[in-house]
């Protein structure tokens, strides 16, 4: 029977008995920086080739005895899990293989560092197709690392590592931290993120996506024909590049932003039981474990958005957050996010001639979150159309003034430390879709676009009282671009996107004992793209 | 995902400009920066990665490489150049006593030292 | 191009222990082993076991266990598989192949067991 | 006694599609996805012409083609030719080993 592992993955409809991958990854190289492997292992012989790459430390401990056997373990196992013959995930992939981790599992930033460069070297010497570098390691937070994923990634390779074992903060580790790079966390078979001693798999906002780590059946270097169970986010992360060569395969055009942005978007959602994360971490870490997309074409015509976060901004007064979107994506919108409810708003601003999303904390705060919404829109043209406050009564309000620009996010921002709280809501008029409305002392942005044949609208939901959150979703076709929450209340902490919900958090009045009577209302800007949507359809 | 983490320790060394009258100075304004794994068991002290600034030649980076050593030998330090970076990012590794990371920090076109560290398995 | 070249024909009696060799060019040594397959006159083919050039490790098939012997000598890109203690069901023609896949075969040596 | 069954012989004429079955168990052919299929001409070594149920290496012709359901795994060769006239042998991974068909002989009906 199909490994737990496979069946995961595996959408429904492929399921059956007979189904065989078309090609599997067979246009696709993908490298591998771990130990050394047993390359003629009957699950990967002829698939894998071993590069003459080698930079490792010396074994600790003097009498450290190196058996081949013990060596080869944790890559035979992940080459495995990538293309093996019967476990692996991308049967038709071809990889090399450098070792820059010891018989213990040791290595250096300075010798993944030299195997990344090796990496490119060769792509320049002898251009191929689509490259995936599989980086099943990680140690503390390294800029150098950080900076040579991003050197890498910037040439065109797709690079996915393990998210980190150390049931802590991926943002704390490397190359986990490269926002360049897909980042995997790992999850079992129950869809629980999992659990490996005392530690598990790390969390947080630098984790793009989870994917089965535990229990993972795969090609053991203890024989020629046998096979092991390992757990740990490298096995994640083996599946995420085996997921990645199947897409570029069939794809072979996909840039790194498109793959990051299929992977999210056929991933299963909101499975992962979240109580296992802490509190904190809860918000940031996304709930998506990943799978094969249904079929191998004809996803081209959907509107691709994700959800960024910051970094935290820290207490201080002026602190401010940035949220940043990948240089082939369009920010959308900017929303901000407080767990004290003390912040003042968030600005889309240019920066190195590309739009950020900035959250600002308000005094007696502990920290805001900026929330990009980050999207691929072909041939956009995007601004920001900003309106100070306005202080009339009637609150605040920008539109998309010009011609075939459309309204996809609006954010609101304020100078004063505590808005109003005693003024009943604006609600938007009837009829005008494309303004944002905000509070009279703030200052408003609208995020207008023009790309062909891109329509959006408006949809709000509201609540007569806090009562934590407030959701609206977009239907089937459309594209959460946007998410924010109308003014006029002091409850409220913030708004974020989750896949394609708009959340708005507030304050629970029940438990805080307020009486207030203020609506909460969550506003979702939902797009779709005709333009895509007719291309798609004239290449089938 | 971004790389601004503040969680890893960073040591911004300043420029005593008496000292070395060899090393030409830095471009006015710009601190070279020494970072190394907030995670003390994993540290390799010893270790560097001298990272040089974006546009630099490989030729620079060798020549960096070398007034390092031959300041350092000025001094009494052995060093030990083990691999000049070219093709990703330019700069190189280094074999040294971390008393020279001040001089280091000095160099030419630097823009960063980093302090090697340990990576597992995971 | 990928070449497996296997030794000459042999003629033994039986008791005697036979060495066929089998060297192989052209490829990546390490990404393969080498598989040993005979077949005896009239009939099908029967899987004998394989040997790592990367490791030396040996997986032999249960039926010749304990009378088969491979070995490789990595110098020369050579295979040896050795047979002992030889009856006369084992003449048959002896081949190598490449991996468990036996994706290029050698062109086989012809091993006759007769008193 | 061979571990998987096959026909001991097939014939068709030239044209004409035939099918060689091999059948195992869910220790081999049901249980791995590495059936291949062999041709051999009367003197020569065999010849690789599917592998993983349904792949053909460079240079083997589409009219070869390969499947499998459950137990079963089956060669398909269409259009039958006079040089297709040879033994076909099926093997199969087991958990530790290799196993082989019996072989079954096509002739090509002149």
């Known amino acids: 029977s199909i490994p737990w592992n496979l069946e995961r993955i595996t959408p429904p409809r492929y399921r059956a008995d007979e189904y065989q991958p078309p090609d599997g990854g067979s246009l696709v190289e993908v490298y591998l920086l771990d130990t050394s492997i047993q390359s003629d292992h009957r699950e990967i012989e002829g698939r894998v080739m071993v590069t003459d790459f080698e930079n490792v430390p010396e074994e600790d401990g003097t009498r450290f005895h190196r058996q081949a056997s013990k060596c080869d373990s944790h890559g035979t196992h992940l080459a495995g899990v990538v293309s093996g013959r019967d476990a692996g995930v991308a049967k038709g992939a071809s990889m090399r293989s450098l070792r820059v981790l010891n018989c213990q599992g040791k290595g250096t930033v300075s010798g993944t560092l030299i195997g990344l460069e090796f990496i490119r070297k060769s792509q320049l010497v002898q251009p191929v197709g689509p490259l995936v570098v599989l980086l099943p390691l990680a140690g503390g937070y390294s800029r150098v690392l950080n900076a040579a994923c991003q050197r890498l990634a910037r040439a065109g390779v797709v690079l996915v590592t393990a998210a980190g074992n150390f049931r802590d903060d991926a943002c704390l580790y490397s190359p986990a931290s490269a926002p360049e790079v897909i980042t995997v966390g790992a999850t079992n078979a129950q869809d629980q993120p999992v659990t490996l001693g005392t530690l598990g798999t790390n969390f947080g906002r630098c984790v793009d996506l989870f994917a089965p780590g535990e229990d993972i059946i795969g090609a053991s270097s203890y024989c020629s024909t046998c096979f092991v169970s390992q757990s740990g986010t490298s096995q994640a992360a083996a599946h995420v590049a085996g997921i990645a060569a199947m897409m570029l395969s069939a794809e072979p055009e996909l840039t790194l932003a498109e793959l990051r942005q299929r992977l999210i978007h056929f991933s299963a959602k909101d499975v992962i039981n979240e109580a296992w994360f802490p509190e904190d971490q809860r918000v940031l870490t996304p709930n998506l474990v990943a799978a094969l997309p249904p079929s191998t074409h004809g996803a081209g015509w959907q509107l691709f958005c994700r959800t960024v976060w910051s970094a935290h901004s820290g207490p201080t007064r002026m602190a401010t957050a940035i949220a940043r979107c990948a240089p082939d994506e369009e920010l959308l919108s900017c929303s901000s996010f407080s767990r004290s409810g003390k912040r003042r708003g968030e600005r889309m601003e240019a920066q190195g001639g590309k739009l950020v999303c900035r959250a600002h904390n308000a005094f007696g705060g502990e920290g805001v979150y900026a929330i990009a919404r980050c999207c691929l829109l072909p041939q956009a043209n995007c601004s920001v159309h900003t309106a100070p406050p306005a202080e009339a009564s009637m609150g605040t309000r920008v539109h998309c003034h010009q011609q075939g620009h459309v309204l996809t996010g609006c954010s609101s921002h304020w100078e004063v430390e505590d808005l109003g709280t005693h003024k009943p809501p604006v609600l938007r008029p009837r009829g005008q879709p494309n303004q944002c409305v905000g509070h009279r002392e703030a200052s408003i942005h609208a995020s207008c676009c023009h790309a062909p044949g891109l329509e959006c609208k408006v949809k709000e939901h509201g609540i007569p009282a806090p009562q934590g959150q407030v959701t609206v979703a977009c239907e089937e076709g459309w594209t959460l671009t946007g998410c924010s929450a109308l003014p006029g209340t002091s409850h409220v902490l913030g708004a974020y996107a989750v896949d394609n919900t708009c959340v708005v958090r507030s304050r629970d009045v029940s438990t805080t004992g307020s009486t207030s009577e203020e609506a909460v209302t969550a506003v979702a800007i939902c797009c779709r793209s005709r333009h895509l949507a007719q291309a798609s359809q004239e290449l089938q | 995902q971004e790389d601004e983490d503040g969680d890893y320790e960073e040591l911004v060394l300043a420029l005593r400009s008496e000292e070395d009258g060899l090393a030409e100075a830095p471009e006015h304004g710009t601190t070279a920066t020494f970072h190394r794994c907030a995670k003390d068991p994993w540290r390799l002290p010893g270790t560097y990665v001298v990272v040089l600034k974006e546009e630099t030649h490989l030729s620079q980076s060798e020549r960096t490489a070398r007034r390092l050593q031959a300041q350092a030998a000025r001094r009494g330090y052995l060093t030990k150049i083990l691999h000049v970076f070219h093709g990703l990012l330019p700069g190189f590794l280094v074999k040294m006593s971390g008393d020279l990371l001040e001089l280091a920090l000095k160099l030419p076109h630097v823009d960063y030292i980093e302090e090697d560290s340990s990576v597992f398995a995971q | 191009q990928i070449q497996l070249v296997q030794s000459g024909a042999e003629v033994k009696k039986p008791g005697a222990s036979v060495k066929v060799s089998c060297k192989a060019s052209?490829?990546?040594?390490?990404?393969?082993?080498i598989s040993w397959v005979r077949q005896a006159p009239g009939q099908g083919l029967e899987w004998m076991g394989w040997i790592s050039f990367y490791n030396g490790n040996t997986n032999y098939a249960q039926k010749v266990q304990g009378r088969v012997t491979m070995t490789t000598d990595t110098s020369t890109s050579t295979v040896y598989m050795e047979l002992r203690s030889l009856r006369s069901d084992d003449t048959a023609v002896y081949f190598c192949a490449r991996g468990y896949g036996m994706d290029v075969w050698g062109q086989g040596t012809t091993v006759t067991v007769s008193s | 006694q061979s571990a998987l069954t096959q026909p001991a012989s097939v014939s068709g004429s030239p044209g004409q599609s035939i099918t060689i079955s091999c059948t195992g168990t869910s220790s081999d052919v049901g249980g791995y996805n590495s059936v291949s299929w062999y041709q051999q001409h009367p003197g020569k070594p065999p010849k690789l012409m599917i592998y993983?149920?349904?792949n053909r290496p460079s240079g083997i012709s589409n009219r070869f083609s390969g499947s499998k359901s459950g137990n079963t795994a089956s060669l398909t060769i269409s259009g039958l030719q006079a040089e297709d006239e040879a033994d076909y042998f099926c093997s199969s991974y087991t958990s530790t080993s290799m196993v082989f068909g019996g072989g079954t002989k096509l002739a090509v009906l002149r």
């Open positions: 052209g490829y990546t040594l390490t990404s393969y082993g």
């Open positions: 993983e149920v349904s």
